[in-house]
Amino acid sequence: MKVLQEPACVSDYMSISTCEWKMGGPTNCSAELRLLYQLVFQSSETHTCVPENNGGVGCVCHLLMDDVVSMDNYTLDLWAGQQLLWKGSFKPSEHVKPRAPGNLTVHTNVSDTVLLTWSNPYPPDNYLYNDLTYAVNIWSENDPAYSRIHNVTYLKPTLRIPASTLKSGISYRARVRAWAQHYNTTWSEWSPSTKWYNSYREPFEQR
């Protein structure tokens, strides 16, 4: 049994780190493998993560952790029974992938504005809470040529779009993702998309 692609891990900077790797051949990850992890810290214990399959040769493990601080460093050991397949380390603060924003809602009853709101995925006491910026992707299933990214660089999880900039009488979808500038993170996954119908019509005199 061999590791084809070594484990690569990212942390949500809250309570979960996710490690993914590929094996040399088809593997029943949960039955054959264990990923052991231990914080390099006085009197810490070794904890075990049972991986799940992620495609035929891929495995993924969700490591449960306490809150993350910059000093945290983990040793990782990938075992197949009594055989040590791989040994490595992981510093969560240096490999952060934020949680995806949630509760994306579109408000179309605000005069001539489409208002999008969503929730910050972190509690106020988390370091990422005040560091997230967002990208909102808006596209139309009726008009495949239309797709826009709106960068939200302010803290408030809202975006206002003049309804007049969207075509009337067609449906649009939106989704949002986040990243944290000062923690040099990757982008989060996209939130689930939400759909709305743009029924806005310009006043007669502006036509």
């Epitope: 914080l39 810290f41 006085q42 009197s43 810490s44 214990e45 070794t46 904890h47 449960l64 952790m65 306490d66 601080v69 910059s70 000093m71 945290d72």
Partner: antibody, heavy 125, light 112 residues
Framework: EVQLVESGGGLEQPGGSLRLSCAGS????????MTWVRQAPGKGLEWVSS????????YYADSVKGRFTISRDNSKNTLYLQMNSLRAEDTAVYYC??????????????????WGQGTTVTVSS | DIVMTQSPLSLPVTPGEPASISCTAS???????????VDWYLQKSGQSPQLLIY???KRASGVPDRFSGSGSGTDFTLKISRVEAEDVGFYYC?????????FGQGTKLEIK
């Protein structure tokens, strides 16, 4: 009541052995790391050894490494310190103390918040 | 090893007056914000040590509020706002960030 009671001290010749015990009660013994600290006559406190809750991680002062062995029997709620190749400079009162909560991924520390009454070890010919 | 240096080593105090003991570590004991791995212990004559302060500034259960800890990184202070006769004994700082745990030399507090 959270309590630690040491036993096993006594007079031993240089080169001899002693085994100290520390019985814990009033707390979930297996969840906590444990520590031994000693105090030579008229001197200050000196850390000797620590062990994680599961017993999987052990730590020793350089002065006792290779001679002393820390262990625990969680089924008996008891901590041990096996002392071999004793030297005159090992003469001290030995205390066991309750250390950090080690079942969490990052052990939670509340200080060495409970100490035993101490057991005296005298190494002399 | 981390060296803990305490001062003063002897501290005569009048009852009702404040007292202060300093402890300097040879390297930072700050693991994360608010988590300085330094404790303060009092050992009264013929007794086991007792915990006063842990993680730099957290008062242990049952410890009178006249005891307080402060500092961060390498410099720490134990303050007693009004010394009482029962406070006499040896005070020790200790770092528990990493093994080997190390203690300061001890400060003998006595009543004038």
């Amino acid at each position: 009541e959270v309590q630690l009671v040491e036993s096993g001290g006594g007079l031993e010749q240089p080169g001899g052995s002693l085994r100290l015990s520390c019985a814990g009660s009033g707390f979930t013994f297996t969840d906590f790391a444990m520590t031994w600290v000693r105090q030579a006559p008229g001197k200050g406190l000196e850390w000797v050894s620590s062990i994680s809750g599961s017993g999987g991680n052990k730590y020793y002062a350089d002065s006792v490494k290779g001679r002393f062995t820390i262990s625990r029997d969680n089924s008996k709620n008891t901590l041990y310190l096996q002392m071999n190749s004793l030297r005159a400079e090992d003469t001290a009162v030995y205390y066991c103390a309750k250390d950090r909560l080690s079942v969490t991924v990052r052990p939670r520390y509340y200080g060495l918040d409970v100490w035993g009454q101490g057991t005296t070890v005298t190494v002399s010919s | 090893d981390i060296v803990m240096t305490q001062s003063p080593l002897s501290l005569p105090v009048t009852p009702g007056e404040p007292a202060s003991i300093s402890c300097t570590a040879s390297q930072s004991l700050l693991y994360s914000i608010g988590y300085n791995y330094v404790d303060w212990y009092l050992q009264k004559s013929g007794q086991s040590p007792q915990l006063l302060i842990y993680l730099g500034n957290k008062r242990a259960s049952g410890v009178p509020d006249r005891f307080s800890g402060s500092g961060s990184g390498t410099d720490f202070t134990l303050k007693i706002s009004r010394v009482e006769a029962e406070d006499v004994g040896f005070y020790y700082c200790m770092q528990s960030l990493t093994s080997p745990y190390t203690f300061g030399q001890g400060t003998k507090l006595e009543i004038k």
